[in-house]
Interface confidence: medium
């Protein structure tokens, strides 16, 4: 019964969040805000199984988001009271415990207003500092409810990185784009997590002809094209981005003229995949692969998908190829020979090689990164509430929908596919070697484009020496601390996660005249080949619903420490049957939180409402003021107590 109630509330919440929402900072004395805080604190206290209740100390920040429903996002400080949790008293009836012996805390919550009296907690994180001891974090997320999260949340970082790379790989614009500003972000806890992020992008001075990916040299062009993208991502039970979709509007720059292309001697250029100059390079490459691979059997190159060469001090080759497991075992064969045939049901590897050839030294230095291809786990959508997704399984592809201003949309392009092949020993997982495209960002020296599915490894966002460049203006994303999402952990992400905020000159230049398309779900599994559409002025679409496992009440900590591309590749479904196309532009609200626009001036005691300032003064007077120590901003998600 409890589950049904929650699902009903969540679905109602979802349906009610379909219209555009506006955010505003509000007075920390606002009466409805106080009711929201009351609901949040009562929720926290109800989950506190032992010890004393916590009592409000003061509200420090508050934002109100008004749409068809109203949300309050706020921070408040709490102190341990003298009433036990089981005392039957409300927190208002408790006094503060003696400061020296009292725990203190800071909570960040988002609460939805359902009616003048009904407030429901969507998400809440509390960092509690015991009187003596380390900070403890508790988290509550309403299971299935969509709620806004901070645009600076580090949880967004891997999705943003993936999104920017995906945009650059899948549109026909001649230049690379970089992240400008994250506008809004929402999250929904399901069996895994759904994210929806809207952000602006800006054209850089790096042309695709000369740059394979964003580097620190790529700078935004003040008069270049801009765009706004909405990315939709589902992070599954295996901690990978299981589905990803993107919808971008592009706005032409003011009087922008593409600078003349210079002849670039050191820039990579395509070479034929059957070029004789690749022969020796490939031999060394497969030798290196077999030497580094712990597999029992040798692999051989099945087909070369793409090859580029760059003239450096010597030559550097970038080769994308598929390797297949052979019948020759390493035990019985000293080396791979021509007679080694590929196994019918052997593993396939999607590989990217970077081979440095120094002719005058007669030396070849290959580096190879591979990931398994084709052994895919079937993901079924279970029965139960899943408001984000349509109900049937469809073909899985990844999409960028680019919508230009003043242009009609070209029809959806169906990318060329290789036929599926049965893999492994299971009768149910029956698709295999698809042409794919990799979406790596900031790879330093790697040009890795074809992203396989399955458990591929070593293809990280931010591998090598150029981790995560070009997402913000000079701001590096670095997730170097574990992001613990509940009990017992302090998160130290702080202000490392700036997504290039505040570059107003790139904010679409007031040209939002392109139609923003309805959201199309699609999936990271078999990613599309290079689009065949002629330019970014047409829309490139592939569609299909995303499977979501059933809702549950998880009780674990999810940690995003150093999220890499190898973690983004999901176990996915085979394309069983086509699904009806479903637009779901309104499955998540446009809710904006401005975490930077909050002032910190003292205000009068509640309920005086004349001064619209934050933080509020203490809820009750306390003999020894001992506010919670300022902590670095931390963002969490946890699946705990979703059904409590």
């Amino acid at each position: 019964m409890k589950l049904i109630t929650i699902l009903f509330l969540c679905s109602r919440l979802l349906l009610s969040l379909t219209q555009e929402s506006q955010s505003e900072e509000i007075d920390c004395n606002d009466k409805d805000l106080f009711k929201a805080v009351d609901a949040a604190l009562k929720k926290y206290n109800s989950q506190n199984q032992s010890n004393n209740q916590f009592v409000l100390y003061r509200i420090t920040e508050a934002t109100k988001t008004v749409g068809s429903d109203t949300f309050y996002s706020f921070k408040y400080e709490i102190k341990e009271g003298d009433c036990p949790v089981q005392s039957g008293k409300t927190w208002q009836d408790c006094e503060y415990k003696d400061a020296a012996k009292a725990a203190t805390g800071e909570c960040t919550a988002t609460v939805g207003k359902r009616s003048s009296t009904k407030f429901s907690v969507a998400t809440q994180t509390c960092q509690i500092t015991p009187a003596e001891g380390p900070v403890v974090t508790a988290q509550y997320d309403c299971l299935g409810c969509v709620h806004p999260i901070s645009t600076q949340s580090p949880d967004l970082e891997p999705i943003l990185r993936h999104g920017i790379q995906y945009f650059n790989n899948n549109t026909q614009h001649s230049s690379l784009f970089m992240l400008n500003e994250v506008k809004r972000a929402q999250r929904q806890v399901v069996a895994g997590l759904n994210f929806r992020i809207t952000y602006s992008i800006v054209q850089t001075n790096c042309s695709k002809e000369n740059f394979l990916f964003l580097t620190p040299d790529c700078k935004s062009l003040w008069n270049g094209d801009t765009g706004e993208c909405t990315d939709n991502a589902y992070i599954d039970i295996q901690l990978r981005i299981a589905s990803f979709s993107q919808n971008c509007d592009i706005y032409p720059g003011k009087d922008f003229v593409q600078p003349p292309t210079k002849i670039c001697v050191g820039c990579p250029r395509d070479i034929p995949t059957n070029s004789p100059e690749l022969e020796e390079t490939l031999t060394h490459t497969i030798t290196k692969l077999n030497a580094e691979n712990n597999a029992t059997f040798y692999f051989k190159i099945d087909n070369v998908k793409k090859a580029r060469v760059q003239v450096v001090a010597g030559k550097k080759y970038f080769i994308d190829f598929v390797a297949r497991e052979t019948t020759c075992s390493k035990e019985s064969n000293e080396e791979l020979t021509e007679s080694c045939e590929t196994k019918k049901l052997g593993q396939s590897l999607d590989c990217n090689a970077e081979v440095y050839v120094v002719p005058w030294e007669k030396k070849i230095y290959p580096t190879v990164n591979c990931q398994p291809l084709g052994m895919i786990s079937l993901m079924k959508r279970p029965p139960g509430f899943s408001p984000f997704r349509s109900s049937r399984i469809g073909e899985i592809k990844e999409e960028t929908t680019v919508s230009p201003p003043h242009t009609s949309m070209a029809p959806a392009q169906d990318e060329e596919r290789d036929s599926g092949k049965e893999q492994g020993h299971t009768r149910r997982h029956d698709w295999g070697h698809e042409k794919q495209r990799k979406h790596n960002l900031g790879h330093g020296h790697k040009h890795e484009r074809d992203q396989g599915h399955g458990h591929q490894r070593g293809h990280g966002l931010g591998h090598g020496h150029e981790q995560q460049h070009g997402l913000g203006h000079g701001h590096k994303f670095k997730l170097d601390d574990d992001l613990e999402h509940q009990g017992g952990h302090v998160l130290d992400h702080g202000h490392k996660h700036k997504h290039g905020h505040g570059h107003g000159k790139h904010k679409n230049k007031g040209k939002k005249n392109g139609k923003h398309n309805g959201w199309k779900t699609e999936h990271l599994a078999s990613s599309s080949e290079d689009s065949t559409t002629p330019s970014a002025q047409t829309q490139e679409k592939t569609e299909g619903p995303t499977p979501i496992p059933s809702l549950a009440k998880p009780g674990v900590t999810v940690t995003f420490s150093d999220f890499q591309d190898s973690d983004l590749i999901a176990t996915m479904m085979p394309p069983i049957s086509p699904a009806p196309i479903q637009s779901d532009d309104d499955w998540i609200p446009d809710i904006q939180i401005d975490p930077n626009g909050l002032s910190f001036n003292p205000i009068s005691d509640f309920p005086d409402t004349t001064s619209p300032k934050c933080p509020g003064r203490p809820w009750k007077s306390v003999s020894e003021i001992n506010p919670t120590t300022q902590m670095k901003e931390s963002y969490y998600f946890d699946l705990t107590d979703g059904l409590s």
């Epitope: 029992t296 279970p382 940690t559 190898s566």
Partner: antibody
């Protein structure tokens, strides 16, 4: 031959620390998410933690979070479990495990180590 | 957390008999359910995953069925080596959880 070999178990006092290792061989370790699963004497199996192939993502069971840290060194084909603030209830056989066959999606474990015993007692 | 409940706790059978083990989830796990066999002093061994798919090398006498919340492991004809403890496990959502086990012993 695909193999996982745990080590590092032993007797430790409550509040103490221990670091378990799991050496992998016979497969490309860096392709797979790795898990720790434990089993208290005479009891059932309890999943402890998982780490993604690159080590970037980790998940912990409630019972260990904040005390245990899972990590991996792909260059050494080794999985680790750093256990701090150990309690008597952490006494168990600790197994590392993975869903080696890709089809399993990492959630069903067909490769297990032989286990290493951790005893927390004063 | 999703609770996994196995029944019976102990099953006393003779070789050659048909054994039916039950596993119930506190909420739907679709078909994301695995069965393991564990013998004393050994690590568990995966028998069935995704409710009904036999893992490599598992004899055909082992079969799994069910979806949602109710699952069954059937051993069509018990062999002497089948006497062991059997666990079910869901992989729908964090944390992954196991049932308490069913001990299949010789009558």
């Amino acid at each position: 031959e695909v193999q996982l070999l745990e080590s590092g178990g032993g007797l430790v006092q409550p509040g103490g620390s221990l670091r378990l290792s799991c050496a992998a061989s016979g497969f490309t370790f860096s392709y797979y998410g790795m898990n720790w699963v434990r089993q208290a004497p005479g009891k059932g199996l309890e999943w402890v933690s998982v780490i993604s192939p690159s080590g970037g993502l980790t998940v912990y069971a409630d019972s260990v979070k904040g005390r245990f840290t899972i990590s991996r060194d792909n260059s050494k084909n080794t999985l680790y479990l750093q256990m701090n603030s150990l309690r008597a209830e952490d006494t168990a056989m600790y197994y590392c495990a993975t869903g080696f066959a890709v089809q399993h999606g990492g959630g069903a474990f067909d490769i297990w180590g032989q286990g290493t015993m951790v005893t927390v007692s004063s | 957390d999703i609770q996994m409940t196995q029944s019976p706790a102990t099953l006393s059978m003779s070789p050659g008999e048909r054994a039916t083990l039950s596993c119930r989830a506190s909420q739907s796990v679709t078909t994301y359910l695995a069965w393991y066999q564990q013998k004393p002093g050994q690590a568990p061994r995966l028998l069935i995953y995704d409710a009904s798919i036999r893992a490599t090398g598992v004899p055909a006498r082992f079969s799994g069925s069910g979806s949602g919340t109710d699952f069954t492991l059937t051993i069509s004809r018990l062999e002497p080596e089948d006497f062991a403890v059997y666990y079910c496990q869901q992989r729908t959502i964090w944390p992954l959880t196991f049932g308490g086990g069913t001990k299949v012993e010789i009558k």
